[in-house]
């Protein structure tokens, strides 16, 4: 056979020869020859390779460092890396999730629009007219003002975005 200039998918060219790449989860031990196939070995414990490859070393699984607020979301295999996420109340600082920060709280006058997850922070929104939030919280939404009318009461003090209305008894008409 004539020496090839290009190789098929899942092959690589070396010494004018097409050799098979190692499958995911295995690393290259020795290139193929005219007499032998590519020699590959499975990655060790806590190692992985996620593509068809000619790597001589497997990659180490990511370490989810609890000191950085991280925990394992999905354990790595010989073909996949470990996926980290953050402890309850924390979220990742980047897509790679290499460290965590405490979820942000929404200040008084703001309510939670979207509760934080392991990968996204709390999203706050200002309380619109008719709603209020009087606490700093990572969970509480804006609450609607109390409806004095339904309680047969009248508004004694108007509500704000930080305070509820104050209801009081209606003034009796004197005879």
């Amino acid at each position: 056979p004539e020496p090839p200039t290009a190789c098929r998918e899942k092959q690589y060219l070396i010494n004018s020869q097409c050799c098979s790449l190692c499958q995911p989860g295995q690393k290259l031990v020795s290139d193929c020859t005219e007499f032998t196939e590519t020699e590959c070995l499975p990655c060790g414990e806590s190692e992985f390779l996620d593509t068809w490859n000619r790597e001589t070393h497997c990659h180490q699984h990511k370490y989810c460092d609890p000191n950085l607020g991280l925990r394992v979301q999905q354990k790595g295999t010989s073909e996949t890396d470990t996926i980290c996420t953050c402890e309850e109340g924390w979220h990742c600082t980047s897509e790679a999730c290499e460290s965590c920060v405490l979820h942000r709280s929404c200040s008084p006058g703001f309510g939670v629009k979207q509760i934080a997850t392991g990968v996204s922070d709390t999203i706050c929104e200002p309380c619109p007219v008719g709603f209020f939030s009087n606490v700093s919280s990572a969970f509480e939404k804006c609450h609607p003002w109390t409806s004095c009318e339904t309680k047969d009461l009248v508004v004694q003090q108007a509500g704000t975005n930080k305070t509820d209305v104050v209801c009081g008894p209606q003034d009796r008409l004197r005879a």
Epitope: P1, E2, P3, V29, S30, C32, T33, E34, F35, T36, E37, E39
Partner: antibody, heavy 117, light 107 residues
């Protein structure tokens, strides 16, 4: 028609040397790796040596390394096996075989080597 | 070294029988295994490559299967010309090694 013809076998004493040849025809010799394989009297096959198509890479099992040398002359379409420090356990029928897609796709008829005092 | 164990050592059959010859590797070799046939007073000839790929000029009654460590050569309806020794050979890593062979003989 692919043809491989071995020659050079014979009866030698332990410690002696012998050079085997394999004449190839019917294919582009310089495009193929070639191996030597031997067959003992109990019919077992044992790989002895291999050489790449260009002659730049050679391979041996541990039991013949340092004693046997495989070589080729592409201009003459000929393969060689220089054997030295021969032992009685080297007694066998020696075949040359062409490597096609990593398989020994064509074999010669063999040449007999006997090592005995 | 990768050791190839062939079984049975001898198989006595009648023409027309269908048979299976086994070759087991001491470690995984994917599909990096060839089968050879050697008739009496002849050189070996390639029968099956890469565990299951057929060879031009070899009758279709010969087929191979298996991957990893366990391989099988099947002969569908043995003919008299099939008697001889069958060898498996691995090319997964150096040194190249052969099985000790299975002798197919007339019952």
């Amino acid at each position: 028609e692919v043809k491989l013809v071995e020659s050079g076998g014979g009866l030698v004493k332990p410690g002696a040397s012998l050079k085997l040849s394999c004449a190839a025809s019917g294919f582009t010799f310089s495009n193929y790796g070639i191996s030597w394989v031997r067959q003992t009297s109990d019919k077992r096959l044992e790989w002895v040596a291999s050489i790449s198509s260009g002659g730049d890479n050679t391979y041996y099992p541990d039991n013949v390394k340092g004693r046997f040398t495989i070589s080729r002359e592409n201009a003459k379409n000929t393969l060689y096996l220089q054997m030295s420090s021969l032992k009685s356990e080297d007694t066998a029928l020696y075949y040359c075989a062409r490597a096609g897609e990593k398989a020994m796709d064509y074999w010669g008829q063999g040449t007999s080597v006997t090592v005995s005092s | 070294d990768i050791v190839l164990t062939q079984s049975p050592v001898t198989l006595s059959v009648t023409p027309g029988d269908s048979v299976s010859l086994s070759c087991r590797a001491s470690q995984t070799i994917n599909n990096n295994l060839h089968w050879y046939q050697q008739k009496s007073h002849e050189s070996p000839r390639l029968l099956i490559k890469y565990a299951s790929q057929s060879i031009s000029g070899i009758p279709s009654r010969f087929s191979g299967s298996g991957s990893g460590t366990d391989f099988t050569l099947s002969i569908n309806s043995v003919e008299t010309e099939d008697f001889g020794i069958y060898f498996c050979q691995q090319f997964s890593s150096w040194p190249l090694t052969f099985g000790a062979g299975t002798k197919l003989e007339l019952k």
